[in-house]
């Protein structure tokens, strides 16, 4: 364990900088210029600098569980929770789950009503009877209900033209009824002859595209629980379909680019309001149906089992069946998926604060287990065999009392666990002894709290009518920095600074802002090691024959020195063996500057004036042109042809000098005039 | 990492020539100046000529009129050494440059030249 402590003042701060920090309560724990912040450290260092082990407040993160006994069938237990959290520490306790036998159930049948569900409808229709006596094999309270979907009654979803809205089916003859979203046709019920009835009377339908919009309907199916008529139970949605799904973003396709607002907005059985929302995306539909303990069974014809199952991936207890063609298997299908996911259990947690962090360890009947998962997971669970599920909560700082729930998903029994800070130190209560603050204020944890008019480390120190800001804005480098830039204590309006404990540290300056420690480092030394420079306040001091930054340069300048030993050309200055170019000069010694603009322009004059002594600095040349030195040899450089006053031609070369604007000048005898017109 | 090999130094008679080449291999793609330095026994390594990628030469007062540095591709550079005086007697390096970080740290193995009188 180890403590990382920042400006630490008080024993609440120190629990609240980390899981390995503790206080030292003792008195006089601290010498003469020691911070607080050293009664905040591990255990280990706090007792080996003496402080006793009941003189040490480390509050620990606990759990108490309570079960509540009322009630009927409870699957999880406890169920209640009350967490005590102490920042970076967890809290772990164990949830087990139990598998009750006849569970009660409430089934939802939602139907695809496109044409091509026309043979499974016919067999839907006989199905209520044997639907429930296959629920009523599982369970002693099975109920069954009825919805139907086909799409959006917009293009290019639908065909809209008015005879097709009428009757979309390709077959005239055929009895259809117009295309729709989503029909509630059955509340959940146990009678088996009311679902034959009102299922008998459905008609199938048509659409124009493949996919379907099955998404929308599954969402209206678990935003409207009072119109379904759901329980507080077992809930399962059987979809059936033969074809894929639309999903959000395809609305645009119709011109519907509101995004689905998760809500229930069912007008007499019907979801009238389908082309006002886009379709659901698949995340939110997941969120939806396990926010409302529903657990999904795609029955779906062979060629879309694949594409079903990626849904099942994302919508956690969710299954899928290969339903026959004409949907004969279904009550097989429902009894096999049904088996599939009461076996597996989920153990979740509602969205909870970036400040609370949650783990599951699930220990599974059959030996398997899962360590740190974000959810628990068991597979496998048979009827009234038990399994354990460690949970794990920490908190990242001290958190506000809030509470969670946990769920086994699909089921409706929660857990219901209550977070409670764990950040104060119950330190030994002598506020009654006032001597020890010069009678001006009262321990806490070891630290006087001084009364107003007095401030310091023993309350020793009369505001005399100043406010505590203003002695303490003596104690700041200036407004915007803290008190004796946090490594001092402020006396009486002046920095006393910490003793520190780290080796070869010294805190100094009027505001404890300097240090010998914390320089530029080189070769994992400050300033190079003691044999290179020193620290002083930030900045290092190199000794003679080292430079640099950090003192990692040796001094010498053999790399800056260019052929005639001049330092970077003169026109830069070297730092660690390398030339630093004036603008424009290019390493390794300054010599070219390509980028420079061309000098024949800037010296007609001074050629003028140094070959001919004519122009306008024929009177004063040497002053105006300082950095030229007329040759009467040719030289190699820069050659130059320019106008001079007198509108001659005049050729000259610069061949460039060590230093700025220095050049050798070589200027032709000759001139060339041309003569005006007569 | 940047390889420099020097080679062409041998004796020679005072007032006669010698052609020194250094070709480097490596990371020539970035070389902007190469050039030559000598050190003789007992003494400071000193420049004594440089070329840049754009043909600028630069020489020691020693060198100029008398040796010339020529380049023939980005990766080897040659000096023309003609009239050699005994105090031209030295180890010959060669040394590339980067326009970034200036010379690259690394010295060749050098070629030593004898000026006999």
């Known amino acids: 364990q180890e403590c990382t402590k920042f400006k630490v003042s008080s024993c609440r701060e120190c629990i609240e900088s980390g899981p390995g920090c503790t206080w030292c309560q003792k008195l006089n724990f601290t010498g003469p210029g020691d911070p607080d912040s050293i009664r905040c450290d591990t255990r280990p260092q706090l007792l080996m600098r003496g402080c006793a082990a009941d003189d040490i407040m480390d509050p620990t993160s606990l759990a108490e569980t309570q079960e509540d006994h009322n009630g009927g069938q409870k699957q999880l237990s406890p169920q209640k929770v009350t967490l005590y959290l102490r920042p970076g520490q967890a809290a772990a306790f164990n949830v087990t789950f139990r598998r009750a036998k006849g569970y009660p159930i409430d089934l939802y049948y939602l139907m695809d009503l496109s044409y091509s569900m026309l043979d499974d409808l016919r067999n839907v229709k006989k199905l209520g009877g044997d639907l429930l006596r296959a629920l009523n094999e599982i369970t002693e309270s099975g109920r069954i209900g009825f919805g139907s979907f086909v799409d959006k009654t917009v293009l290019p979803f639908v065909n809209t033209h008015p005879d097709k809205l009428r009757n979309p089916c390709p077959n005239k003859e055929k009895e259809c009824q117009p295309p729709f979203a989503f029909r509630h046709v059955l509340k959940l019920t146990n009678n088996s002859n009311q679902f034959q009835t009102e299922v008998g009377k459905q008609l199938i339908s048509g659409n124009l595209d493949a996919p379907e919009g099955g998404l929308d309907a599954m969402m209206q199916v678990a935003a409207c629980p009072e119109e379904i008529g759901w329980r507080n139970v077992t809930r399962l949605l059987v979809f059936a379909t033969d074809d894929g799904f639309h999903f959000a973003g395809d609305g645009k396709l119709g011109a519907i680019l509101t995004p689905n607002d998760g809500r229930c907005h069912l007008e007499d059985n019907l979801y009238k309001r389908s082309n006002e929302f886009d379709y659901p995306s698949v995340g939110q539909l997941a969120h939806k149906l396990a926010e409302n303990n529903i657990q999904p069974i795609f029955a779906v014809t062979s060629r879309m089992v694949k594409t079903y199952e990626k849904l099942t991936e994302i919508i956690p207890k969710s299954a899928v069946g290969e339903l026959s063609e004409d949907s004969s298997n279904v009550v097989h299908l429902i009894k096999n998926a049904y088996n599939k996911l009461s076996s597996r259990v989920f153990l979740d947690h509602n969205a909870l604060p970036d400040t609370l962090k949650v783990t599951y360890d699930s220990f599974c009947s059959n030996g398997v287990t899962h360590r740190n998962q974000p959810r628990g997971d068991c597979d496998g669970v048979q009827i009234n065999v038990p399994i354990t599920f460690q949970v794990k909560v920490t908190a990242t700082e001290c958190i506000q009392e809030q509470s969670f729930v946990i769920r086994a998903l699909g089921f409706t029994d929660i857990v219901t666990v209550q977070v409670l800070p764990q950040c104060e130190c119950r330190c030994r209560d002598q506020s009654r002894d006032r001597s020890l603050c010069h009678g001006k204020g009262f321990l806490e944890c070891g630290i006087c709290r001084c009364d107003t008019g007095y401030i310091g480390k023993n309350c020793e120190c009369q505001t005399q009518g100043r406010s505590s800001q203003e002695l303490e804005g003596s104690c700041r480098k200036d407004n915007n920095s803290i008190i004796c830039s946090g490594l001092g204590d402020c006396v009486c309006g002046q920095c006393l600074c910490h003793t520190s404990d780290v080796p070869g540290k010294l805190i100094y300056g009027q505001y404890c802002e300097c240090d010998t420690i914390n320089c530029e480092r080189y070769n994992g030394q400050v300033c190079g090691g003691p044999g290179r420079g020193l620290c002083f306040c930030g900045k290092c001091r190199c000794h003679p024959g080292f430079e640099g930054s950090a003192c990692q340069c040796e001094r010498t300048t053999e790399g800056c020195l260019n052929p005639r030993r001049v330092e970077c050309s003169g026109r830069g200055r070297c730092r660690c063996n390398v030339c630093e170019c004036h603008s424009g000069y290019q390493l390794p010694l300054c010599q070219e500057c390509p980028g420079c603009p061309s000098p024949c322009g800037k010296y007609i004059s001074c050629a003028e004036c140094l070959k001919f002594e004519k122009g306008p600095f024929g009177k004063n040349c040497s002053a105006a042109c300082p950095g030229l030195q007329l040759s009467n040899n040719p030289v190699k450089g820069r050659t130059c042809k320019e106008r001079d006053s007198e509108g001659c031609w005049v050729a000259y070369t610069l061949e460039q000098q060590d230093g700025m604007d220095r050049y050798l000048i070589y200027v032709d005898e000759s001139r060339e005039c041309v003569a005006g017109p007569n | 990492e940047m390889q420099l090999v020097e080679s062409g130094g041998e004796l020679v008679q005072a007032g006669g020539s010698l052609r020194l080449s250094c070709a480097a291999s490596?990371?020539?793609?970035?070389?902007?100046?190469m050039g030559w330095y000598r050190q003789a026994p007992g003494k400071q390594r000193e420049l004594v000529a440089t070329?840049?990628?754009?043909?600028?030469t630069d020489y020691s007062d020693s060198a100029k009129g008398r040796f010339t540095i020529s380049r023939d591709n980005k990766n080897t550079v040659h000096l023309q050494m003609n009239s050699l005086k005994p105090e031209d007697t030295a180890v010959y390096y060669c040394?590339?440059?980067?326009?970034?970080?200036?010379?690259?740290?690394?010295w060749g193995q050098g070629t030593q030249v004898t000026v006999s009188s």
């Open positions: 070329i840049s990628s754009s043909g600028y």
């Open positions: 490596g990371s020539v793609s970035s070389i902007n100046v």
């Open positions: 040394r590339a440059s980067t326009l970034r970080t200036g010379w690259f740290t690394g």
